[in-house]
Amino acid sequence: ESLGTEQRVVGRAAEVPGPEPGQQEQLVFGSGDAVELSCPPPGGGPMGPTVWVKDGTGLVPSERVLVGPQRLQVLNASHEDSGAYSCRQRLTQRVLCHFSVRVTDAPSSGDDEDGEDEAEDTGVDTGAPYWTRPERMDKKLLAVPAANTVRFRCPAAGNPTPSISWLKNGREFRGEHRIGGIKLRHQQWSLVMESVVPSDRGNYTCVVENKFGSIRQTYTLDVLERSPHRPILQAGLPANQTAVLGSDVEFHCKVYSDAQPHIQWLKHVEVNGSKVGPDGTPYVTVLKTAGANTTDKELEVLSLHNVTFEDAGEYTCLAGNSIGFSHHSAWLVVLPAEEELVEADEAGSVYAGEQKLISEEDLGGEQKLISEEDLHHHHHH
């Protein structure tokens, strides 16, 4: 498949597989305990550099947070230390181990007699929310062409089943906040916005929480707008040409325009020995313009047959639309047929077979812009 600008832009490298949801450990610690998480290398092989992450954010070592390649210790744990922890390979961001940690108010070794109630809140069946596929949560930036649809997803789990809510730029986000509304699917952990517009740009945060903790993920949405512009002409076209007397020549001009373009081919001429009029605009003659039966494709080519020395000179492809005009020019050099052609001399003369690009400097440092008004003035000179 050929990929165009419509393909999504993401702020991360290619996705890598992570552990299955069943491999995620759910651990309970008491307030004041040391949280110890161990992540041995898979298969006993070399570990390589790793990074420890909590709720999607890299952990910074401190006096209380001790980070090692295979081990994480959080001393004097408090409720705020609850959350989803993972150990990842630094280079690939592959999730090696994933833990759902809950820190309870009572010490984990406490002798709470209310066993029935406690059974509901501790052990492997309970815990703070965690991402079910954390390796899919690394992409943060989404750039989408206007008028398309965006879906943000934050699939999570926990016990009890967490709730999900959405923020835009840090504030509660509801359907009435955008024209066209939003569609929420709590069972799919998703937010959908149809037919996005530039005002939808911003940061979107999903907040997933239950009584044991909260996790969040922020995505940035950019909406790509097609701003109206004057025609764009392909660089390097038309190209300068050198032709032998009596041969045929083609100039090409590739025009890109969202609005309907009007294409003309002009030849620069002299009037009374002058190339420009009193107001400084060039004298031109229109060689080719849109007619009833002319296609854009036909207008993008100017064909000169059986060229004479009079055909030598400067040619301009002029394209205009409702926004404005663009033009590119090229030169035609006509050489005598019988003359033995030599390579360019030190002065830079053009020889047959070479398309020597004549720079703005060569042309005296100025390229004249021919306006629509100029065209009306100089059409028939």
Partner: antibody, heavy 127, light 107 residues
Framework: EVQLVESGGGLVQPGGSLRLSCAAS????????ISWVRQAPGKGLEWVGR????????NYADSVKGRFTISADTSKNTAYLQMNSLRAEDTAVYYC????????????????????WGQGTLVTVSS | DIQMTQSPSSLSASVGDRVTITCRAS??????LAWYKQKPGKAPKLLIY???FLYSGVPSRFSGSGSGTDFTLTISSLQPEDFATYYC?????????FGQGTKVEIK
């Protein structure tokens, strides 16, 4: 009002060529894509291909790859389906449909949805 | 290519009936599934996208569900204008593929 109008269908001999047009109006042609879908008489729907006019990026079904070419002229808000080396099995009603993407960071694909369709144009390949 | 199989191929029902059409994918397509309705001689119309999202302007009696390989289109109370052929279509894989269609006829 969003409108898509196909034209260019007709009778053509096997091995021949035909160019279908899809004139779009009522929406920003350069923001979304155009898909072509065909339906043989009495049969189901078959996706033919898709273009995103702004980039010119195209995708085709294997059954038409190398024979059919989709293009677009953004200045005319028109998409085209150039069909060469036509076969009897290409006989069908050809629909063009506005196509938008559902962009989702969580997955590795873009879901494409065809929300507005033209009325269709019949192409008959027969000797 | 991902094969989409609809069942039943046709069904007869009365106005007011609850109708369920299923669509099975030959491999996981996540929720990337759309449902279209087509009347004879007319172009298809989008009903549901992303398995369960009702397209704007479509009556709420239509609903979609499912993910992975098994999907369902439900019409809660069949109306006269609902007698048509329904197609499912996936677009996770290339190419996009349609089911063979389910024709809903008047009993």
């Amino acid at each position: 009002e969003v409108q898509l109008v196909e034209s260019g269908g007709g009778l053509v001999q096997p091995g021949g060529s035909l160019r279908l047009s899809c004139a779009a109006s009522g929406f920003t042609f350069t923001s979304t894509g155009i898909s072509w879908v065909r339906q043989a008489p009495g049969k189901g729907l078959e996706w033919v291909g898709r273009i995103y006019p702004t980039s010119g990026s195209t995708n085709y079904a294997d059954s038409v790859k190398g024979r059919f070419t989709i293009s677009a002229d953004t200045s005319k808000n028109t998409a085209y389906l150039q069909m060469n080396s036509l076969r009897a099995e290409d006989t069908a009603v050809y629909y063009c449909a506005r196509t938008y993407g559902i962009y989702d960071l969580y997955v590795d694909y873009t879901e494409y949805v065809m929300d507005y369709w033209g009325q269709g144009t019949l192409v008959t390949v027969s000797s | 290519d991902i094969q989409m199989t609809q069942s039943p191929s046709s069904l007869s029902a009365s106005v007011g009936d609850r109708v369920t059409i299923t669509c099975r994918a030959s491999q996981d397509v996540d929720t990337s599934l759309a449902w279209y309705k087509q009347k004879p001689g007319k172009a298809p119309k989008l009903l549901i996208y992303s398995a369960s999202f009702l397209y704007s302007g479509v009556p709420s009696r239509f609903s979609g569900s499912g993910s992975g390989t098994d999907f369902t289109l439900t019409i809660s109370s069949l109306q006269p204008e609902d007698f048509a052929t329904y197609y499912c279509q996936q677009s996770t894989g290339h190419p996009q593929t349609f089911g063979q269609g389910t024709k809903v006829e008047i009993k």
